[in-house]
Every structure is written in structure tokens, then in C-alpha cells.
Interface confidence: low
């Protein structure tokens, strides 16, 4: 399968260093120039660096010149980005992208998030949003999980280990005044299922190695 | 550096209708020697990496549906979607690859224009677990509405709240083209326990009058 898989992102303090990797498969790696492109949260695409197929030539955006080093290992089919003297404004999802050898990018990885902050990693607290008469409308009930006070992004939320996807809305995280993130994930289900069906939200915060499975049930009075 | 400017910043088009996005470069990206424009178009769906749609300004990448087409030359370019589908909800970027630094436009957010749908409104009290931690979050959910503009006001014992809530909105749903919104009112446990009635009032184009959902603290 033709694909690019980035790794190495995470939380780093201002002034610190991080090395990103991008494993390529399914094409002749040495024949193509490769690029790093980044995307700050909620912003557009920003080209970072390119390296020729042989690795002999590199180019950098002015914003990273002298701080970032792009390289490649043809034997490992891997692209690297060594990031030094990191700044808060380097916070972004970093994508690895294959060059068509004409300068457009015909294959992209899924990206790896780099967060540059002096804050510490913190795992979330997960609280149930319990269904009740106040969260029922015309035979449909809503329930959810509040994933609160974590850092850095991201967290992933699934329901019933991925078996429940219909009617699920996981909201974008908001940055609270405390500097910690919070998000909600909700699902609408038939009211009639509340007594019979089990609903569990599965929360994973990789930066803190936190995994929580929270059962959400009607509040017993 | 070559500056790429897209217009409009956002665009709402009905299903089956034509969508047009423009891109202007600060200098020509046409090589007259081979009459090729070094310009590409990318589609980025929510939570996904970008995907190449068009290169050489008008050549479709393999696997891209033929409803996508590119045109233009020199400094002015257009991406056209001839018959918009629900799955085309995305941000679209143009990119010049005439020279490094390669530069992208700021992006154009394309949404589906559909009929008005009023939100279903739900309210959730804080859990006992959370109250034990000393904080109370009250959540108001607005589900599956269109258009995106909605107003949520929190009232505590009928007193309007400000500065203590945060909202988050989903991207447009790729199936029914609606939005959902969560608004979270955050209080200390001590403040929460001083009051009885918690209400969120929702105003939306699809509602003939505001809808209020409320609960009394301590009651089921």
C-alpha cells in the first residue's frame, strides 16, 4: 500500500528539540523529493521544507531556516525533520508529503501534532453526561461524556469500542482559561434503548498514556 | 515570495449546484516555454490531510471525480465543482509550485447550503463525580441544525450569565449537512450549589421563538 506515516510529535518546551519521522512505503522512495508541510490549529497550510530524491539538496521556509534540518535515509525509506530551538508558533500538525518531482504534493501522511508549550502533560478527567427527561426529545435521548482538563491535544473518543458511530458528535476541543483543554462527545439514541443497551465512551489521551472507559447510564434517583 | 490569495473565504452552495473558487497569484506561475501553469488545488476534509485534486492548473489527479475541474492561466485560476455533493464539504487550497518557497492560498471553506433545520436542544447537569472534584460543568447540546448561526444564552435563577461559558461547533455533517453545537457553563461547586434553576436558551433561524431547556439542581 502506498502510504506515509509520521511519528515523533508531542509536547516540547520552548527552546527544546524534537525529531519527526515519516516512514514511506509502496513507492520507490529514492526517486522522489519529499516535503514537510505544517498546519497550525485552525489555520491553513504552510510549506516547511523539501529535500531532493538523493538528499543532496534541501530548501527551507524562512521561518524555520537555521533551526530545522530535513534529511532522509534511503535504506530505511524514511524522511526526518530535526526541529531545534522550538517556539510556540511552531505548534502545528506536521505532514509529510511526497513530491511529484514537479513541486506539487501527490501523497500525504495523516500528520503528527507538535505542541510547543511550557505547560505539563496532564491526563483528562472523564465525566458522564447522563440521559434524563431533560435530554430526551420525541423518542430520542442524548447522552455523552465530558472530557475535561487535559493537555496537550489530542484526545480520541469512541463509543462502545467503535461499534457505535451513528448519531455521534465529538466536538472540537476548547482551550479553557486554565490553559487546559476540554471537549464533549455526545450520541443520540432511541429512548427505548436506555434500559437495555450499555453505552460506554472510550477516551484515549496518548500524550499522558491515559485510557478511560466510562459507562454512561441514566441517573438513579 | 509568491503570495496566493483565494476568494471567497467561505462559500455555501446547494447540493447539485455549481461551486466556484478563485485563486490569484502575486506573479505569473506560467512558464511560457511549455505553456504550463505551476498551480495545484487540494481538498482537505475535516480531520484529514489534504488531497491533491488538480495539477498544472487543469489536470485532474487520477481517481478525482470529473465534477472537479480547474482553469485559468498566469495569475488567475478557478476551481469548479460542477455538481456539488455532500462529501465535497471541505477546505480547498490552491498552491503554486513555480518556485520555492512553495506557497498556499489561505483556503476556502465550502459548505452545503440546505434547508433550514431547527436544533434539538438537550441539557445535562454536572455529574456527581465532577462535583466531588470541586467544579461543575453544565452542558447544553444543540443537535443537527442549519444554518450554522445559533445563539445560546445561559440563565441561572433567571440571571443572564456571561464570561463563564464556552462553545464548540462540529464541522458540517457529510450526510445531512447539519451542524451541532455544545455550550458548557463552568462554575465552582460552591457557586453551583448557591442556585437552583439552570437554563439554556437557544435562538436559531429554524425556531419561531427561542427554546429553553432547564433543570432544577438536585432534582431528577
Amino acid at each position: 500500500e502506498v502510504q506515509l506515516v509520521e511519528s515523533g510529535g508531542g509536547l516540547v518546551q520552548p527552546g527544546g528539540s524534537l525529531r519527526l519521522s515519516c516512514a514511506a512505503s509502496g513507492f520507490t522512495f529514492n526517486n522522489y523529493a519529499m516535503n514537510w508541510v505544517r498546519q497550525a490549529p485552525g489555520k491553513g497550510l504552510d510549506w516547511v521544507s523539501t529535500i531532493s530524491g538523493s538528499g543532496g539538496t534541501t530548501n527551507y521556509a524562512d521561518s524555520v531556516k537555521g533551526r530545522f534540518i530535513i534529511s532522509r535515509d534511503s535504506s530505511k525509506h524514511t524522511l526526518y525533520l530535526q526541529m531545534n530551538s522550538l517556539r510556540a508558533e511552531d505548534t502545528a500538525v506536521y505532514y509529510c508529503a511526497k513530491d511529484s518531482n514537479w513541486g506539487n504534493f501527490d501523497l500525504w501522511g495523516r500528520g503528527t501534532l507538535v505542541t510547543v508549550s511550557s505547560a505539563s502533560t496532564k491526563g483528562p478527567s472523564v465525566f458522564p453526561l447522563a440521559p434524563s427527561s431533560k435530554s430526551t426529545s420525541g423518542g430520542t435521548a442524548a447522552l455523552g461524556c465530558l472530557v475535561k482538563d487535559y493537555f496537550p491535544e489530542p484526545v480520541t473518543v469512541s463509543w462502545n469500542s467503535g461499534a457505535l458511530t451513528s448519531g455521534v458528535h465529538t466536538f472540537p476541543a476548547v482551550l479553557q482559561s486554565s490553559g487546559l483543554y476540554s471537549l464533549s462527545s455526545v450520541v443520540t439514541v432511541p429512548s427505548s434503548s436506555l434500559g437495555t443497551q450499555t453505552y460506554i465512551c472510550n477516551v484515549n489521551h496518548k500524550p499522558s498514556n491515559t485510557k478511560v472507559d466510562k459507562k454512561v447510564e441514566p441517573k438513579s434517583c | 515570495d509568491i503570495v496566493m490569495t483565494q476568494s471567497p473565504d467561505s462559500l455555501a452552495v446547494s447540493l447539485g449546484e455549481r461551486a466556484t473558487i478563485n485563486c490569484k497569484s502575486s506573479q505569473s506561475v506560467l512558464y511560457r516555454s511549455n505553456n504550463r501553469n505551476f498551480l495545484g488545488w487540494y481538498q482537505q476534509k475535516p480531520g484529514q490531510p489534504p488531497n491533491l485534486l488538480i495539477y498544472w492548473a487543469s489536470t485532474r489527479e487520477s481517481g478525482v471525480p470529473d465534477r472537479f475541474s480547474g482553469s485559468g492561466s498566469g495569475t488567475d485560476f478557478t476551481l469548479t465543482i460542477s455538481s456539488l455533493q455532500a462529501e465535497d464539504v471541505a477546505v480547498y487550497y490552491c498552491q503554486q509550485y513555480y518556485t520555492t518557497p512553495y506557497t498556499f492560498g489561505q483556503g476556502t471553506k465550502l459548505e452545503i447550503k440546505r434547508t433550514v433545520a431547527a436544533p434539538s436542544v438537550f441539557i445535562f447537569p454536572p455529574s456527581d463525580e465532577q462535583l466531588k472534584s470541586g467544579t461543575a460543568s453544565v452542558v447544553c447540546l444543540l443537535n443537527n441544525f442549519y444554518p450554522r448561526e445559533a445563539k445560546v444564552q445561559w440563565k441561572v435563577d433567571n440571571a443572564l450569565q456571561s464570561g463563564n461559558s464556552q462553545e464548540s461547533v462540529t464541522e458540517q455533517d457529510s450526510k445531512d449537512s447539519t451542524y451541532s453545537l455544545s455550550s458548557t457553563l463552568t462554575l465552582s461547586k460552591a457557586d453551583y450549589e448557591k442556585h437552583k434553576v439552570y437554563a439554556c436558551e437557544v435562538t436559531h433561524q429554524g425556531l419561531s421563538s427561542p427554546v429553553t431547556k432547564s433543570f432544577n439542581r438536585g432534582e431528577c
Epitope: 531532493s52 530524491g53 539538496t57 514537479w102 513541486g103 | 512558464y31 511560457r32 518556485t99
Partner: nanobody, 121 residues
Framework: QVQLQESGGGLVQPGGSLRLSCAAS????????MSWFRQAPGKEREFVAV????????FYADSVQGRFTVSRDDAKNTVYLQMNSLKPEDTAVYYC??????????????WGQGTQVTVSS
């Protein structure tokens, strides 16, 4: 896969002319500088000429300035080296190469196999 294929070499008398061609495939050359190098027996490979991007001109080694002319036809994805007033010391294998970046980096990812030019009476 980028490939460069030289042609046009051969045996020519001193004072004569030859036109070398280098056809590129796998990459559109219009964005890239295209260069000619040569390597005489027992010597290091040396720079001869570069055709920069269209409109950006060409540069030559001192030893060939005024005698050799480099040109490019981006529509045909081909670069040429017109060699006039040839001398015995021009005898070498001539290689073309494509610059590895759109800027004029002087670093080359891809080379042709070479074509032999022999200047002799």
C-alpha cells in the same frame, strides 16, 4: 523515474562543430537548471555550461565561452549544446544533468549516461 539521454556525439575534426542533445523524461525540465559537464580520460569531471530556467540566461566555463552555446526547448523537454570551433582538448565524454531544485543549487540528482566527443584529425 527521471532519465536523461544524451546523443549527438562522435568524431569531428579540429575547427568543426557538433550539436549534442539531452532528452529528459520523468520530470518537466522547465523549472530546473540543465547543465552540461565533461570528463576527459584520466581527468575529473568538469563543468561546461548551464541553461538556467527560461529567461534566466546561460553560463559557461571559461574554456568554452564564445565557442559553445547551450539552449533549451522546454516544450520538448530537451537541452542542447552547440559546440563550434572544436579543439582536441575538447575530447571527452559529455554528460547532462538536471539541477535537483528549482533554485540554482548546483546540486544534481540525476545524470545521463554520457556521449563521447572526439576531436581529432
Amino acid at each position: 523515474q527521471v532519465q536523461l539521454q544524451e546523443s549527438g556525439g562522435g568524431l569531428v575534426q579540429p575547427g568543426g562543430s557538433l550539436r549534442l542533445s539531452c532528452a529528459a523524461s520523468g520530470r518537466t525540465i522547465s523549472r530546473y537548471a540543465m547543465s552540461w559537464f565533461r570528463q576527459a580520460p584520466g581527468k575529473e569531471r568538469e563543468f561546461v555550461a548551464v541553461a538556467r530556467r527560461s529567461g534566466d540566461g546561460a553560463f559557461y566555463a571559461d574554456s568554452v565561452q564564445g565557442r559553445f552555446t547551450v539552449s533549451r526547448d522546454d516544450a520538448k523537454n530537451t537541452v542542447y549544446l552547440q559546440m563550434n570551433s572544436l579543439k582536441p582538448e575538447d575530447t571527452a565524454v559529455y554528460y547532462c544533468a538536471i539541477d535537483s531544485d528549482t533554485f540554482y543549487s548546483g546540486s544534481y540528482d540525476y545524470w545521463g549516461q554520457g556521449t563521447q566527443v572526439t576531436v581529432s584529425s
